[in-house]
Interface confidence: low
């Protein structure tokens, strides 16, 4: 621990002190530096502030002091392992008072009522007071008058100037003052007395239709004298007329855009085509918004949204019925539908497309399809602007040709039954096929149960009268051709148990 000794002539001047100390034990790691700290027991007891660091081979330094601080010093030695224990503290040195060297910063003037101005600033830290107390000399005058300054000395970090006119610019100065004098000549800040609601009404220059869902709105800059405050910008509010449902208690949904003060146009996008809109533009300041200029406009027709809920219904091996609902968003007057389709495994070749010119149409029958192919069907509604977004479905009339046509086929078993389940494909024609359960093992002699006729649409089949604890092969036939095989084993003891609820049996 370094032993701190203040030299006899410690105060070299009123603002400098010489501090010396005896070297610290280095404990086999050289002292790299000494940190000289001070505490002011009057203003900030128990808080130590660094005044500076000096190299480890130095045992004294001259420190620059601030006015009116009760300095108590200590020194800490630092080596590569970190700081040691601080030295005992010195006697207290009190520097003489002096006039402030700094003024408050962050000076602002703004009204919180229409007829006042509140002047605020960041108070000086105690280290900058240079005396036991500090006050603030606040000066103000209307900008541009070059007339006399009004002034007041206050202790609080604010001053309310009352009885001002609405939104007048003021020159403001705030200077630190203590018993020894004043701080530097303060910088002039411009503040404003309180704002009132704007009286300016933006004058609309016009609305340019960009497309069926976007418009450009333009207006003339407002007269700043009518803003009664700092123009912060413009509030643009718009809503679709007739968007309030009849007998609905819900409010009309209004959209808002805030436009900066230096901009006098805005693009409104995401509008619904073929709709009437109401528009309001208001100037606003810190107090609020002024009166609105109003306008109505209509968006032109656009392309419609996608048709709803396209279903495929198999009519025969070669024909499908398409069934749909019209789009939720017409975006204009519907003129009909466009239907396109192509076989999936032909790489998009062979696409057929035709117009259905009846907007009231909800179904269409397709014939001459190949029974062995899957198709991609695409349906679009149309307005005079053209076809809209498509709804897409895949399917076909194809006859069963392997396990993939069943989708997720599985079998489970109880003691004397087995349930075979599958997921029918949408658009697949219903057909009938055989299921055959064949017992395995020597003692069973490979006995088969009678083949059962099953409908594809029923999605499951339960086979009863099986032997407990027996392996079965399940064979699926269609038109006497073997299509699929799977295996299942029944449970133990032969007690009869019912299958789970909800399974169809034949």
């Amino acid at each position: 621990v370094p032993r701190l000794v203040l030299s006899d002539l410690h105060l070299l001047t009123q603002s400098q002190v010489r501090v010396s100390w005896s070297p610290a034990e280095d404990h086999n790691a050289p002292i790299e530096k000494y940190d000289i700290e001070f505490e002011d027991k009057e203003m900030a007891p128990e808080k130590w502030y660094s005044l500076g660091k000096v190299p480890g081979n130095q045992t004294s330094t001259t420190l620059k002091l601030s006015p009116y601080v009760h300095y108590t010093f200590r020194v800490t030695a630092i080596n590569k392992y970190g700081p040691g224990e601080p030295s005992p503290v010195s006697e207290t040195v009190v520097t003489p008072e002096a006039a402030p060297e700094k003024n408050p910063v962050d000076v602002k003037g703004e009204g919180n009522e229409t007829t006042n101005m509140v002047i605020t600033w960041k108070p000086l830290r105690w280290m900058d007071w240079n005396a036991p107390q500090v006050q603030y000399r606040v000066q103000w005058r209307p900008q541009g008058t070059r007339g006399p300054w009004q002034e007041q000395i206050v202790s609080d970090p604010f001053l309310v100037v009352s009885n001002t006119s609405t939104f007048v610019p003021y020159e403001i100065k705030v200077q630190a003052v203590n018993s020894q004098g004043k701080g530097p000549e303060p910088q002039v800040t411009i503040g404003y007395s309180g704002e009132d609601y704007p009286q300016a009404i933006p004058e609309l220059e016009g609305i340019e239709i960009l497309n069926s869902s976007a418009v450009l709105v333009k207006w003339r800059p407002v007269d700043l004298a009518q803003v009664k405050g700092h123009l912060r910008g413009y509030n643009v509010t718009y809503w679709r007329e007739g968007s309030q449902r009849k007998h609905s208690k819900r409010h009309i949904h209004k959209d808002h855009v805030v436009v900066p003060a230096n901009t006098t146009s805005v693009i409104l996008s995401g509008l619904r085509p073929y709709s009437s809109y109401h528009l309001e533009v208001q100037a606003f300041n810190g107090r609020g918004s002024g009166p609105a200029s109003e306008f109505t406009f209509s968006t032109p027709e656009g392309v419609p949204g996608h048709p709803e809920a396209l279903h495929l219904e198999c009519q025969s091996n070669t024909s499908l019925l398409l069934r749909w609902q019209p789009p939720l968003s017409h975006n204009g007057v519907l003129t009909g539908y466009v239907l396109s389709y192509h076989p999936l495994d032909e790489g998009g070749k062979g696409q057929l497309s035709f117009n259905l010119r009846d907007p009231e149409l909800r179904t269409h029958n397709l014939t001459d399809l190949s029974p062995h192919l899957r198709y991609r069907f695409q349906l679009q509604a149309t307005t005079k602007e053209g076809p809209g977004e498509a709804i897409v479905r895949e399917g076909g009339t194809m006859a069963l040709s392997g396990i993939s046509d069943f989708g997720n086929i599985s079998a489970t078993a109880g003691e004397n039954y087995s349930v075979v389940s599958w997921v029918p494909k949408e658009g697949q024609c219903n057909f009938r096929f055989h299921i055959l359960f064949k017992a395995l093992g020597e003692e069973k002699g490979g006995a088969s149960l009678s083949p059962q006729y099953v409908s594809y649409n029923q999605s499951s089949y339960t086979q009863w009268d099986l032997q407990p604890d027996t392996d079965y092969e399940i064979h699926l036939f269609k038109e006497r051709m073997f299509r699929h095989q799977m295996a299942v084993k029944t449970n133990g003891t032969g007690r009869v148990r019912l299958p789970p609820a909800g399974f169809a049996t034949e």
Epitope: S15, P67, A98, A99, E101, V105, D106, V107, K108, K122, K182, P184, E185, Q187, V188
Partner: antibody
Amino acid sequence: QVQLVQSGAEVKKPGASVKVSCKASGYTFTSYWMHWVRQAPGQGLEWMGNVYPGSGSTKYAQKFQGRVTMTRDTSTSTVYMELSSLRSEDTAVYYCARPGNYEGFAYWGQGTLVTVSS
Amino acid sequence: NIQLTQSPSSLSASVGDRVTITCRASESVDSYGSSFMHWYQQKPGKPPKLLIYLASNLESGVPSRFSGSGSGTDFTLTISSLQPEDFATYYCQQNNEDPWTFGQGTKLEIK
């Protein structure tokens, strides 16, 4: 009106020191910070530091710390800038400058050319 | 240290032209609701002259064809219609943070 008048040109050898003065008039000398800015030939402006005549407080740019000293004499309303251990790259015009009522250096001295040459 | 980068470094223009000089700071120079950025004009052999203080305020006695704008890190000095006496070097300067720093300068020459 505010006036800042600087001392005349100096020629110094490397390693020497130079002391430039700036005499202020037309305002309350102790109320405004005074700054020093230098400009090497054909180069831009470089802030060196400042001094507050009211108390003698100083603030120096890190680059000049240890080589520059700024002082004031309130009896003659003069500030001084002393630069030691001169090198050839210290050849420059040295300006004193004072902020206006708002911000920015509104008032400048006429400049002092310091030439460092062996 | 806050670095200030001016662009362009030099430009040629004619009397009557509108000229824009930009200054980009390596970090924000905004504090207390103000932008501590200033613009100066300097002619050969003369000290700099303050044109714009606090980003957008015209110094007393400076012609209104000079204007400043910007906040945070991006600032612009605009001369709306060049006059013969405007051909000079222009500097931006910040004093939001020590050390106070200047841009490298933009030399405006006659075309």
